[in-house]
């Protein structure tokens, strides 16, 4: 097998030190196009279990504003426009990486933190127990 | 504006190279308890406008497993458990951080990327276009 | 979804030997770098040895150069610990563990198999 070099411009590590801190470049690769959910769909208000969307904004985080979604109801939306309790309206969620400032305040220093985030919400069965 | 002091014990950073690169502790802070999707929930079954989750892997990107969403049907489930073709589903999407190693194959040096997943289907009403 | 099974935990004697193994699934083996990693009573976790995608190169904490070996066959989607000359403070629930790009750092891990060495 073939060996990969160690690429002689990567910045230096001390085993001592090493892996507790990497370096990490924060021009940020973007294959999409919009970061905005609102503009990017309007099915948080044509789903049958549409939700509403509450910025959670932390300035010692980065990114500094994630979007939360919190469903309108505990159940559907029918086709007569009517909520069906039947039914129920559930958060899709999601664990997402995020940069914490570490020192707080810090311009450059961070620690790497896992946040689960409700992305947006999906109409579902209800799991019935029946009582004997 | 209050202006946050910056905190002395911060490493050092010259204004040239910030914000470009930081550093990044590695001792992940994690708020959740499981990552599996197919275990936190099954969502995916039970609701009106199911989904399969596929393993998107690359072992060049952390995370190096992200579960994608795609939906099972292109209507929503009814009541009597049949297709409704009147109604969409569509997936939820997301946008969120990975890290990939930048340059190639240094072992201690990263670059944000912004990648779009979808989480999860929701069943929407579809926009009707009435031809004149 | 990503699963590893470890086994070959035993009670041995001081000296004695033990080959632990780890089943993996739900990834593709192959692409990523496999781990041994401990934990003993009381103490934190430990990286024991890991192994590259194609087993050419293999790495070990100082503590067990020269009694463990780790080895790996990827036909199989397995990974192996040939542990010998065990000492007292081998003790340890051992755990194989999915690489990542970042190093040192799994996200995935088995649920461990116990090495008691005691006389």
């Known amino acids: 097998g073939i060996t990969i070099p160690r690429n002689p411009g990567c910045p230096n590590s001390e085993d001592k030190n090493f892996p507790r801190t990497v370096m990490v470049n924060l021009n940020i690769h973007n294959r999409n196009t919009n970061t905005n959910p609102k503009r990017s769909s309007d099915y948080y208000n044509r789903s049958t279990s549409p939700w509403n969307l509450h910025r959670n904004e932390d300035p010692e985080r980065y990114p500094s504003v994630i979007w939360e979604a919190k469903c309108r109801h505990l159940g559907c939306i029918n086709a007569d426009g009517n909520v069906d309790y039947h039914m129920n309206s559930v958060p899709i969620q999601q664990e997402i990486l995020v940069l914490r400032r570490e020192p707080p305040h810090c311009p450059n220093s961070f620690r790497l933190e896992k946040i689960l985030v409700s992305v947006g919400c999906t109409c579902v069965t209800p799991i019935v127990h029946h009582v004997a | 504006g209050i202006t946050i002091p910056r905190n002395p014990g911060c490493p050092n950073s010259e204004d040239k190279n910030f914000p470009r690169t930081v550093m990044v502790n590695l001792n992940i802070h994690n708020r959740n308890t499981n990552t599996n999707p197919k275990r936190s929930s099954d969502y995916y079954n039970r609701s009106t406008s199911p989904w399969n989750l596929h393993r998107n892997e690359d072992p060049e990107r952390y995370p190096s497993v992200i579960w994608e969403a795609k939906c099972r049907h292109l209507g929503c489930i009814n009541a009597d458990g049949n297709v409704d073709y009147h109604m969409n589903s569509v997936p939820i999407q997301q946008e969120i951080l990975v890290l990939r190693r930048e340059p190639p194959h240094c072992p201690n040096s990263f670059r944000l990327e912004k990648i779009l997943v979808s989480v999860g289907c929701t069943c929407v009403t579809p926009i009707v276009h009435h031809v004149a | 979804q990503v699963q590893l099974q470890e086994s070959g935990g035993d009670w041995v004697q001081p000296g004695g030997s033990l080959r632990l193994s780890c089943g993996a699934s739900?990834?593709?083996?192959?692409?990523?770098?496999m781990y041994w990693v401990r934990q003993a009573p009381g103490k934190g976790l430990e990286w024991v040895a890991k192994?590259?995608?194609?087993?050419?190169?293999?790495y070990y904490v100082d503590s067990v150069k020269g009694r463990f070996t780790i080895s790996r066959d990827n036909a199989k989607n397995s990974l192996y610990l040939q542990m010998n000359s065990l000492r007292a403070e081998d003790t340890a629930v051992y755990y194989c563990?999915?690489?990542?790009?970042?190093?040192?750092?799994?996200?995935?891990w088995g649920q461990g198999t116990l090495v008691t060495v005691s006389s």
């Open positions: 739900g990834f593709t083996f192959s692409s990523y770098w």
């Open positions: 192994i590259k995608q194609d087993g050419t190169e293999k």
């Open positions: 563990a999915k690489g990542e790009i970042l190093p040192h750092y799994f996200d995935y």
